[in-house]
């Protein structure tokens, strides 16, 4: 049994780091493998993560952490029974993938404006709370070419757009994702999408 692709890990900079790797053949990850991880700290102890299958030869493990600070460094040991298959280290602050925003809502009751709001996925005491910016994706269910991205570079988790910028009388979907430039993160996963009917009517012209 050998590791084909070494583990790579990303942290949500809160409580979970996810490590993925590939074996050289079909593997029952949860019964055959264990990933041991330990914070490099005088009083820390090793924790065991039981991996799950992620495709035939792929494995994924979710490492639970109390929290994360920039100085944290973890040692990682991948075991198959008594055999050490791979040894490495992981600094969560250098491999961050933020949590996806939640509770995306489209408010259509504001006269000519669509207001999209969502929730910041971090608590106020987390470093990323005040450093996230967002991308909002809006697309038409009827027309695949009607697909747009709005970059939200301010901290408030909301976006206002004129209803007239979208076609009237058809259904749209929206989703949102987050990243933090200052922490050099990747983009988060997209939030679940939300659907609404754009019923904006052009005002009658006065002659």
């Amino acid at each position: 049994m050998k590791v084909l692709q070494e583990p790579t890990c990303v942290s949500d900079y809160m409580s979970i780091s996810t490590c993925e790797w590939k074996m050289n053949g079909p593997t029952n990850c949860s019964t055959e493998l264990r990933l041991l991880y330990q914070l490099v700290f005088l009083l820390s102890e090793a924790h065991t993560c039981i991996p799950e299958n992620n495709g035939g030869a792929g494995c994924v493990c979710h490492l639970l952490m109390d929290d994360v600070v920039s100085a944290d460094n973890y040692t990682l040991d991948l075991w198959a029974g008594q055999q050490l298959l791979w040894k490495g280290s992981f600094k969560p602050s250098e491999h961050v993938k933020p949590r996806a925003p939640g509770n995306l809502t489209v408010h259509t009751n504001v006269s000519d404006t669509l207001l999209l709001t969502w929730s910041n996925p971090y608590p106020p005491d987390n470093y990323l709370y005040n450093h996230l910016t967002y991308a909002v994706n809006i697309w038409s269910e009827n027309d695949p070419a009607d697909f747009r991205i709005y970059n939200v570079t301010y901290l408030e988790p909301s976006l206002r757009i004129a209803a007239s910028t979208l076609k009237s009388g058809i259904s749209y979907r929206a989703r949102v994702r987050a990243w933090a430039q200052c922490a050099n993160t990747t983009w988060s996963e997209w939030s679940p999408s939300t659907k609404w009917h754009n019923s904006y009517r052009e005002p009658f012209e006065q002659h």
């Epitope: 700290f41 005088l42 009083l43 820390s44 102890e45 109390d66 600070v69 920039s70 100085a71």
Partner: antibody
């Protein structure tokens, strides 16, 4: 709410023994390393000893090595410090502290006086 | 003699910004993070800053920490009378397999 309550302090003669206890509540005791820190009257803080969450690894300050023993009972959520061969310079308030990178929660302390 | 050196005293007037330093000796390993504790008169110490610059929840953002090599500093802005206390720096010393604490700095708020 995290609470740490020390007990067992008192007056003891030089060469005597004392056992301090620290009852923990409000958090999962078995998941945290713990430590003892002391403060002699009018002096600064001095780290005494620390123990990992399972008790597998233990550390002592040079000043108490060989005389003090730290231990824990995770089933009772209690930390202990057995102090033997006590000296006058061990007179201090002894604080129990939870460890999360630093000493993030402290008890109110128990006074140990070593005097003849 | 502590491995970490702090000034024995510091002072400032209300509203001022004061800084307390904590210096490791030249041979002191610089891999560890610094922590800061506040001890108000007659009470147990309280964690103020951990891992160089992180504030536990409930600690006002008037308190900030920084690290440079083997030294650290604690800054208190908008000084208040209730900040009058003893302040200690500390770090895990992996060469000693233990925790080292500075001698403490007594902060006096004047006026």
């Amino acid at each position: 709410e995290v609470q740490l309550l020390e007990s067992g302090g008192g007056l003891v003669q030089p060469g005597g023994s004392l056992r301090l206890s620290c009852a923990a509540s409000g958090f999962t005791f078995s998941r945290h390393a713990m430590a003892w820190v002391r403060q002699a009257p009018g002096k600064g803080l001095e780290w005494v000893s620390a123990i990992t969450s399972s008790g597998r690894s233990i550390y002592y300050a040079d000043s108490v090595k060989g005389r003090f023993t730290i231990s824990r009972d995770n089933s009772k959520n209690t930390l202990y410090l057995q102090m033997n061969s006590l000296r006058a310079e061990d007179t201090a308030v002894y604080y129990c502290a939870r460890v999360h990178r630093a000493f993030d929660y402290w008890g109110q302390g128990t006074l140990v006086t070593v005097s003849s | 003699q502590s491995v970490l050196t702090q000034p024995p005293s510091a002072s400032g007037t209300p509203g001022q910004r004061v800084t307390i330093s904590c210096s490791g000796s030249p041979l002191f390993p610089d891999s560890g993070s610094f922590n800061w504790y506040q001890q108000l008169p007659g009470t147990a110490p309280k964690l103020l800053i951990y891992a160089d610059s992180h504030r536990p929840s409930g600690v006002p953002d008037r308190f900030s920490g920084s690290k440079s090599g083997t030294s650290a500093s604690l800054a208190i802005s908008g000084l208040r009378s209730e900040d009058e206390a003893d302040y200690y720096c500390g770090t895990w010393d992996y060469s000693l397999s233990g925790y080292v604490l500075g001698g403490g700095t007594k902060l006096t708020v004047l006026g």
